[in-house]
Amino acid sequence: FERTRSLQDPCSNCPAGTFCDNNRNQICSPCPPNSFSSAGGQRTCDICRQCKGVFRTRKECSSTSNAECDCTPGFHCLGAGCSMCEQDCKQGQELTKKGCKDCCFGTFNDQKRGICRPWTNCSLDGKSVLVNGTKERDVVCGPSPADLSPGASSVTPPAPAREPGHSPQ
């Protein structure tokens, strides 16, 4: 790494992956192992994030970018940059302080994360229920009752729930 020659800030020429080393007469030095600098002109390198315990490494740390973590199977990310891992539940359940609990009647959760939500109110849009909701699935709305031909049954039984369904994101 060549010594910088800038008349203003001699550190401004230090590229990402290096730091401006005051102890070595402001020479651009490479970031030490397990550290990185994502922008140029930095006077220190940042310590790499370590993905431990329930976190697992999604992307290794490099000299220019931090490590990225996700969660081990059975858990999903929460927060910016996956700052927390939260336990998965089954479809048809939500996570409470007491663990995974089934959705109450009239609500559903088609994912392994998140909360039980009320079934869609089809009549809001002037539609009717085409397929009934379950704990694992929302209703499917269909045409308004007036659009149905005489004698046609409007409601279909729900499709059987299957794993894995909506994958955790």
């Epitope: 088609d110 849009d125 499917v140 994958s167």
Partner: antibody, heavy 119, light 107 residues
Framework: QVQLVQSGAEVKKPGASVKVSCKAS????????INWVKQAPGQGLEWAGN????????NYNQKFKDKATITADKSTSTAYMELSSLRSEDTAVYYC????????????WGQGTTVTVSS | DIQMTQSPSSLSASVGDRVTITCRPS??????LNWYQQKPDKTVKLLIY???RLRSGVPSRFSGSGSGTDFTFTISSLQPEDIATYFC?????????FGQGTKLEIK
């Protein structure tokens, strides 16, 4: 009638960010999912993610997790998708869509917003 | 992710012809299959949802059938205004995925 009106075309330099908006009208904004779909030139459709405006709960396609941030403003009935660290591969038409009544199909589509990334 | 294999990728047919497009998901999606039409001006419209349900206002010449891993979209009598690209989409499992599209032209 139900309508989704998107913001105009954008030309951006690589590395920049862009925020595409989608203004909803003719229905209760908080009661339906808004999806975002990408269509690169000459390509098919790719689901990027969605948001439930009532509580801003989001789902993302893993492919877009580091690229897109989806938000919604209930006061203006507007959904947004911000794309960061733009690259030429992000050049595409981006559509917002509304579900049909449950999240499983997309009944109403915006007119699309063309985002061009070019140096 | 569920892969959606749509065929054919393009087809040319005459006005009045019966046109069929197939869509095969890589796993069982029950009936959570939708069909969309994208016109040359890039506007997109839902035609059929939940495999076979015709969206209100859509002409009855459009129909859909199937379940599980085998779905069919049919135009019973092709009209000039049907020139478009047609896409299938599964709504069963996140991330939602689309077929690659079928570009329909008039002979």
């Amino acid at each position: 009638q139900v309508q989704l009106v998107q913001s105009g075309a954008e030309v951006k330099k690589p590395g920049a960010s862009v925020k595409v908006s989608c203004k909803a009208s003719g229905y209760t904004f908080t009661s339906y999912w808004i999806n975002w779909v990408k269509q690169a030139p000459g390509q098919g459709l790719e689901w990027a993610g969605n948001i439930y405006p009532s509580d801003s709960y989001t789902n993302y396609n893993q492919k877009f997790k580091d690229k897109a941030t989806i938000t919604a403003d209930k006061s203006t009935s507007t959904a947004y998708m911000e794309l960061s660290s733009l690259r030429s591969e992000d050049t595409a038409v981006y559509y917002c869509t509304r579900d049909y009544g449950s999240a499983y199909s997309m009944s109403t589509w915006g007119q699309g917003t063309t985002v061009t990334v070019s140096s | 992710d569920i892969q959606m294999t749509q065929s054919p990728s393009s087809l040319s047919a005459s006005v009045g012809d019966r046109v069929t497009i197939t869509c095969r998901p890589s796993q069982d999606i029950s009936n959570y299959l939708n069909w969309y039409q994208q016109k040359p001006d890039k506007t997109v419209k839902l035609l059929i949802y939940y495999t076979s349900r015709l969206r209100s206002g859509v002409p009855s010449r459009f129909s859909g059938s199937g379940s599980g891993t085998d779905f069919t979209f049919t135009i019973s009598s092709l009209q000039p205004e049907d020139i478009a690209t047609y896409f299938c989409q599964q709504g069963d499992t996140l991330p939602y995925t689309f077929g690659q599209g079928t570009k329909l032209e008039i002979k």
